[in-house]
């Protein structure tokens, strides 16, 4: 369980958080997903990144840095002024996050036009768009702090980047594999179930016959199915116990004003872990 920090602690100075939950310690919860989230650190008076496990935890957890700052830093919205830079950012800096179609797990960086910062995202390993950098420095150099008045040579190079009509993207799932999503609006963070638990059983592409289990979200139970040994999706577990442990926790009851809600939520960042398929 989360502990609340003591507001009277002398190290904290006089700054009071906007909400009591901003004083709570970061709580990754008992689950094992790896979801990049942000919390307000009462000791540094800053919003910082932490890795959320995907269930339970507390309310001091935000999907974006901006949302954390707006919620927990007094006067943040008044003082947050757009950086006045005469330099033009290439158009691809404003492209939405696109993890592509593949199922790899590559750590990349993109410029987030909402937070005006370069942030980490998970790239699937193919396709996508040009708002995709190998290093944070490269992203910052090109999109956060572009150099002033580029030379004519640079202008010619940048024209290559002006438009990217490459993608029309529905980013919730790709190949039935869950991919990162950038939430557009602040929302209540209750519990987010693992999205692959909502996928249908998929026997895959090969010819083997292996006994596996999948979570049936309609019945709330794990059922047996035959897996052919390759392909398929992540709703695929070697034992019923593993299946239940991974997916059953996706349905938790949140008491809110006396009403019991059952919520399933897609996690904005999910580390996809593959059981061996070859």
């Amino acid at each position: 369980l989360s502990e609340e920090a003591d507001d009277t602690d002398s190290e904290l100075g006089s700054m009071k958080p906007l909400h009591t939950f901003c004083a709570m310690k970061a709580d990754d919860g008992p689950c094992k997903a790896m979801i990049r989230s942000y919390f307000f650190n009462m000791y540094t008076h800053q919003c910082e990144e932490f890795i959320y496990g995907g269930c339970e935890g507390n309310e001091n957890r935000f999907d974006t840095l901006e949302e954390c700052k707006k919620t927990c830093i007094p006067g943040y919205e008044k003082t947050a002024v757009k950086a006045a830079s005469g330099a033009e950012r290439p158009d691809f800096c404003f492209l939405e996050e696109d993890p592509g179609l593949c199922r790899g797990y590559m750590k990349r960086y993109l410029y987030n036009n909402q937070t005006k910062q370069c942030e980490r995202f998970v790239y699937g390993g193919c396709l996508g768009n040009r708002n995709n950098f190998e290093t944070l420095d490269e992203c910052k150099k090109i999109c956060e702090n572009p150099v002033h008045s580029p030379s004519p040579v640079n202008e010619v190079q940048m024209s290559d980047y002006v438009t990217d009509g490459n993608t029309v993207t529905d980013r919730s799932t790709v190949n039935n594999i869950v991919v990162p999503q950038s939430p557009k609006v602040p929302r209540r963070r209750d519990y987010r179930g693992r999205p692959w638990c909502l996928q249908p059983a998929d026997s895959g592409l090969c010819k083997a016959s292996e006994r596996r289990f999948y979570y049936n979200s309609a019945t709330g139970k794990c059922h047996r199915f035959n897996y052919t040994g390759c392909g398929g999706n992540n709703n695929n577990f070697t034992t019923r116990r593993r299946c239940l442990r991974s997916c059953k926790t996706g349905l938790i009851k949140n008491k809110s004003k006396g009403v019991v809600k059952i919520q399933r939520r897609k996690a904005p960042f999910v580390k996809v872990v593959y059981e061996s398929i070859n």
Partner: antibody
Amino acid sequence: EVQLLESGGGLVQPGGSLRLSCAASGFTFSSYAMSWVRQAPGKGLEWVSAISGSGGSTYYADSVKGRFTISRDNSKNTLYLQMNSLRAEDTAVYYCAILGATSLSAFDIWGQGTMVTVSS
Amino acid sequence: QSVLTQPPSVSGAPGQRVTISCTGSSSNIGAGYDVHWYQQLPGTAPKLLIYGNSNRPSGVPDRFSGSKSGTSASLAITGLQAEDEADYYCQSYDSSLSGSGVFGGGTKLTVLG
């Protein structure tokens, strides 16, 4: 058995249109991204286009962007490539392939191909 | 001009070992993208031979192996057999092309004798 069967190729004049189909069987079609790859006579392979399992995300090579449209009908287990404003350099065998099925990002399984000839 | 560079041809006698190189750049192989290899026998469609730099799909003999280092990759074939005579293509993705798929120009393997 997993099978991909392309059709719709043929002879077409420059500026004309053609629609290729790829009928898939033996696997859960809607679960996989699909791609088109082409090979000009006596030449190497060239990636053309790709589409996500849901059909919500599409990608194109610069050489065909604005002229070709990839789509899929998951109820019919069929992948399509609508080719407009065809040019002589589009002459090739067109293959459909499953993308990232047993691998993470390779073209795992290929169809036998359909020949498209653009000539006046 | 292909984004990935392969030698146009290689040859070897039965039982020998041959390697085919695939040279890229910092925007493709060097950017962390996987390299895949395909075999195309005469008059047939390409077939996946090696995926993810060094993995063999089921059914591919262990005479075929792949490796990747820096901005290049290579395919090695040991114990060369007559039926290995084919075109071999490497493939990856390129960040300067919005992550588009890119292929090598292909290498024709001739088994001598």
